[in-house]
């Protein structure tokens, strides 16, 4: 297993609709054709695999399970979007990138993006 640098923004604020997007960029040492991207959440004394996708370079990301994540890839960048977030989902979201094929296997883990989620205030009742 060889190490690889992964960069991601330090902080992202989710939209009022609970959507957060960030770019995960990896310094590919070679020409990988198969890449696996996993988003981990570290918070509340837990580590959770939020979503994971494997893709062939130039193709769409295919996420596992009924994922709350979507994404696109462009070169060595992966644009990730996490939907349906609520205030309690605030936490550090870490991008993990694995170059699966061809060998050698490379692994890179980013420092994490702190995603802040603020639940929208309910609209006050109106007489009009």
């Amino acid at each position: 297993c060889k190490a690889m640098h992964v960069a991601q923004p330090a902080v992202v604020l989710a939209s009022s609709r609970g959507i957060a997007s960030f770019v995960c960029e990896y310094a590919s040492p070679g020409k990988a054709t198969e890449v696996r991207v996993t988003v981990l959440r570290q918070a509340d004394s837990q580590v959770t695999e939020v979503c994971a996708a494997t893709y062939m370079m130039g193709n769409e990301l295919t996420f596992l399970d009924d994922s709350i994540c979507t994404g696109t890839s462009s070169g060595n960048q992966v644009n990730l979007t996490i939907q349906g977030l609520r205030a309690m989902d605030t936490g550090l979201y870490i991008c993990k990138v694995e170059l699966m094929y061809p060998p050698p296997y490379y692994l890179g883990i980013g420092n994490g993006t702190q995603i802040y989620v603020i639940d929208p205030e309910p609209c006050p009742d109106s007489d009009f």
């Epitope: 959440r41 959770t48 939020v50 994971a52 596992l64 399970d65 994922s67 709350i68 989902d89 979201y93």
Partner: nanobody, 125 residues
Framework: EVQLVESGGGLVQAGDSLRLSCAAS????????MGWFRQAPGKEREFVAA????????SYADSVKGRFTISRDNAEKMVYLQMSSLKPEDTDVYYC??????????????????WGQGTQVTVSS
């Protein structure tokens, strides 16, 4: 409806390994998030690990990360908790639970609809 039955608990020495099993009944097992929780007498139930419906995604409490591994076999309707490098503080009753909700960034807080009766794990020093 899902019925859950845990097994595999027992008395072990610190540093030993143990594998807990959870047998589920019900045709829709593969659509449930499965979790393991533990509870000591007089204490609150504590999240240990969870696994997504397909088994592709997992979640662990920091206290067990790297020592415990959760897995599932949807064909056999089984969930497992492989526990290694056990410590005396792992002593608890371990419960298997099922939640019919989408995977989320915090499966520990999901609403678990079904629970097993628990299996005792005792780790002596």
């Amino acid at each position: 409806e899902v019925q859950l039955v845990e097994s595999g608990g027992g008395l072990v020495q610190a540093g030993d390994s143990l594998r807990l099993s959870c047998a589920a009944s019900g045709r829709t097992f593969s659509s449930y998030i499965m979790g393991w929780f533990r509870q000591a007498p007089g204490k609150e139930r504590e999240f240990v690990a969870a696994i997504s419906s397909s088994g592709a995604l997992t979640s662990y409490a920091d206290s067990v990360k790297g020592r415990f591994t959760i897995s599932r076999d949807n064909a056999e309707k089984m969930v497992y908790l492989q526990m290694s490098s056990l410590k005396p503080e792992d002593t608890d009753v371990y419960y298997c639970a099922a939640a019919r909700v989408p995977w989320s960034p915090r499966p520990s807080l999901s609403t678990y609809d079904y629970w097993g009766q628990g299996t005792q794990v005792t780790v002596s020093s």
